[in-house]
């Protein structure tokens, strides 16, 4: 249980200002013979909380007019260092006829409630009760700066004390510190530093790589214009006032450079005509990546060595390289750029496209009837190597037989060797329509244009072949 003891009382009002690093004890005159009768602290159970005061009830009321009530003058300004303790109070003498008075503490217009250490003491006499409301802070902080007043309510009247201004002084406090920046080589830039007291003034020195930049201090706020840098530097600022100095955080000023090449490239997927790659970008050179370039060249030593370049956005580090040859080997390099320039190309990596179905049909398809053996002979030319899109494993022949009211399609598979085939006549007095497609492990290519031949009835001979011309032979 906390016991509150009465404080020694100073004679008379205490005007003016007090600068101290000790606890000022300011109170009422003790000369008039008041005896401390009752005191309580906000922590005592069953008692009113901070500043709420109940005057003991008075049974007799005198009829003579009462003087106006006012708080006694006390110290107006207390200056002290951060983390010191302070105690201040306001006092008032209240005629005993008044009941249910309350005293509350206010700071900068807001009532102080809760966890503040406020104690109210009573010194009753025959006609009046002297009330002293004390407010103490054990370790002041900057946030305790401000104007404190007491308020007392009596019969719906509000009595307000003179303000007590608390000024907490300490080392400079930064309100704006320099920020890390990425700058272009040899290009001017600004850094800002701002610090406040009290006490004021606050003076600023700038420090670059542990050396002071300005010999004479500048009043806060200060803007440092750096004409340009050729290499990374660390800047900080020192803020000085009468209490000492505070140093800001050190900030690194980086020089923008070309990026490093990617650290990783992955081949995600390959098809006959495309390769999907992803990459992990290297160091960005303190400047955001803008776009990337994928360089592709045929790995075949006999190729002409020309490089295909595909430009793409820097994100999402993924690109599908298209329009590639099937079953081909490629060397791939990746480079990315920022505002300064392009990175070196990554080490060249190898990737291959898969087999695809041929992209063109066999050429020069010729069909003729060999009546003696009752067969249809078919001849063709294989597709150009570049358009085979893989290794030919054979051909698929479609032959459709049409006569009055009958239509019948048959499919034949032919091995890759040679470029001719023979099929049996299925129906006489009918039209045979032939189409051929080349086949690789990647699939079946497109069928050639249809070639028609009429198969006459037995004994009627027509040796003229039907054909599709090779391109350019039409």
């Amino acid at each position: 249980r906390e016991e509150a003891k009465p404080y020694p009382l100073f004679p008379g009002p205490f005007p003016g200002s007090l600068q101290t690093d000790h606890t000022p004890l300011l109170s009422l005159p003790h000369a008039s013979g008041y005896q401390p009768a009752l005191m309580f602290s906000p922590t005592q159970p069953g008692r009113p909380h901070t500043g709420n005061v109940a005057i003991p009830q008075v049974t007799s009321v005198e009829s003579k007019p009462l003087p106006p009530l006012a708080f006694k003058h006390t110290v107006g300004h207390i200056i002290l260092s951060e983390h010191k303790g302070v105690k201040f109070n306001c006092s008032i003498s209240v005629p005993n006829i008044y009941q249910d008075t309350t005293i509350s503490w206010w700071k900068d217009g807001k009532e102080l409630l809760g966890a503040h250490h406020a104690i109210t003491q009573f010194y009753p006499d025959d006609e009046v009760t002297a009330i002293i409301a004390s407010f103490s802070i054990t370790s002041v902080q900057r946030s305790d700066n401000g104007s404190y007043i007491c308020k007392m309510k009596i019969n719906n009247e509000e009595i307000v004390s003179d303000p007590i201004y608390i000024e907490v002084q300490g080392l400079p406090h930064f309100t704006k510190q320099p920020e890390s920046m990425n700058v272009t080589r040899n290009t001017a830039f600004n850094l800002t530093c701002q610090a406040v007291g009290p006490p004021e003034p606050v003076n600023i020195f700038w420090v670059q790589n542990s050396s002071r930049v300005n010999e004479q201090p500048e009043k806060s706020p200060s803007v440092l214009t750096v004409p340009g840098l050729t290499e990374m530097a660390v800047f900080s600022c020192e803020a000085h006032n009468d209490k000492g100095l505070t140093v800001s955080k050190g900030v690194q000023i980086n020089i923008k450079a070309i990026p490093s090449p990617p650290t990783e490239v992955s081949i995600r997927n390959s098809t006959a005509h495309s390769i999907l790659i992803s990459w992990v970008p290297g160091f960005d050179g303190y400047s955001p990546f803008r776009n990337c370039s994928i360089q592709v060249k045929e790995a075949d030593p006999l190729s002409n060595g020309s490089v295909m370049i595909f430009n793409t956005s820097a994100l999402p580090h993924l690109y599908q390289i298209k329009q590639l040859q099937a079953l081909a080997n490629y060397s791939i390099g990746v480079s990315c750029m920022n505002e300064i320039g392009w990175s070196a190309v990554s080490p060249w990596i190898l990737a291959s496209t898969t087999e695809g179905a041929p992209s063109v049909a066999p050429l020069n398809v010729t069909v003729f009837l060999n009546e003696s053996s009752d067969n249809v002979d078919i001849r063709w030319m294989k597709p150009p190597t570049k358009q085979q899109d893989g290794e030919l494993v054979g051909y698929r022949i479609s032959h459709v037989w049409q006569s009055a009211g009958i239509s019948k399609e048959l499919l034949e598979e032919v091995g890759q060797n040679g470029s001719r085939a023979r099929i049996s006549v299925q129906v006489h007095n009918a039209t045979c329509t032939v189409r051929i497609a080349a086949v690789t492990r990647g699939g079946v290519g497109p069928f050639s244009d249809p070639v028609k031949i009429f198969i006459p009835a037995h004994g009627w001979v027509d040796y003229a072949p039907s054909s599709t011309p090779a391109p350019g032979n039409a």
Epitope: E264, I267, R268, N269, S331
Partner: antibody, heavy 128, light 111 residues
Framework: EQQLVESGGGLIQPGGSLRLSCAVS????????MSWVRQAPGKGLEWIGI???????YSASWAKGRFTISRDSSKNTMYLQMNSLRAEDTAVYFC??????????????????????WGQGTLVTVSS | DAQLTQSPSTLSASVGDRVTITCQSS????????LSWYQQKPGKPPKLLIY???DLASGVPSRFSGSGSGTEFTLTISSLQPDDFATYYC???????????FGGGTKVEIK
């Protein structure tokens, strides 16, 4: 400053397990593949395995099953879990940054281009 | 598994000598040039000297050079310096295989 620091080595009995750590500073594990390499006393270098920037791991054929590489990106640290240790696993274990790596996702393998930054190593002694 | 064979295993030389170390691979190195050379001094980790068979790593003196392609590679020190006495390793990767192979090492010692 870019730096690799291995820890976790020491004396361990045959059949025991040990976890080595490689603390990375100055760059991010999410932008570089990392590798483990070991060197038996008086012998040459032997590659153990790699963890790519995406977290895929590839190991030397002899290390598969006993040695596992992992990482904790939030701590910027790579690990080597070694189980069923044998006397012939006695070596200095190095972690190294992979300067460039190509991954073949569809075929589940990858190739190291170079190891451009190495830690000082941590000694593991397997002995009863 | 592919193997890298270095020769000689030990080399005695004097300051100022021109020194050549060879590295032979049992099959073609990836992209024919993904071969690196490392230098290691006693009690220290290896240090990258050369990559892509012939490119000098950052900060490596120009007296070091590399050449070769496919399966045959060479490291040359044009004029041996006192700081160059160390063990040198070649290393490389191969298509279709994640293994990173190291050569057996060549120790360059003072004659």
């Amino acid at each position: 400053e870019q730096q690799l620091v291995e820890s976790g080595g020491g004396l361990i009995q045959p059949g025991g397990s040990l976890r080595l750590s490689c603390a990375v500073s100055g760059f991010s594990l999410s932008s570089n593949a990392m590798s483990w390499v070991r060197q038996a006393p008086g012998k040459g270098l032997e590659w153990i395995g790699i963890i790519s920037s995406s977290g895929s791991t590839y190991s030397a054929s002899w290390a598969k099953g006993r040695f596992t590489i992992s990482r904790d990106s939030s701590k910027n640290t790579m690990y080597l879990q070694m189980n069923s240790l044998r006397a012939e696993d006695t070596a200095v274990y190095f972690c190294a940054r992979v300067g460039f790596f190509v991954g073949y996702g569809a075929y589940d393998y990858g190739i190291i281009h170079r190891l451009d930054l190495w830690g000082q190593g941590t000694l593991v002694t397997v002995s009863s | 598994d592919a193997q890298l064979t270095q020769s000689p295993s030990t080399l005695s030389a004097s300051v100022g000598d021109r020194v050549t170390i060879t590295c032979q691979s049992s099959k073609s190195i990836y992209n024919n040039n993904w071969l690196s050379w490392y230098q290691q001094k006693p009690g220290k980790p290896p240090k990258l000297l050369i990559y892509d068979a012939s490119d000098l790593a950052s900060g490596v003196p120009s007296r070091f050079s590399g050449s070769g392609s496919g399966t045959e590679f060479t490291l040359t020190i044009s004029s041996l310096q006192p700081d160059d006495f160390a063990t040198y390793y070649c290393a490389g990767g191969y298509s279709g295989d994640s293994d990173y192979a190291f050569g057996g090492g060549t120790k360059v010692e003072i004659k």
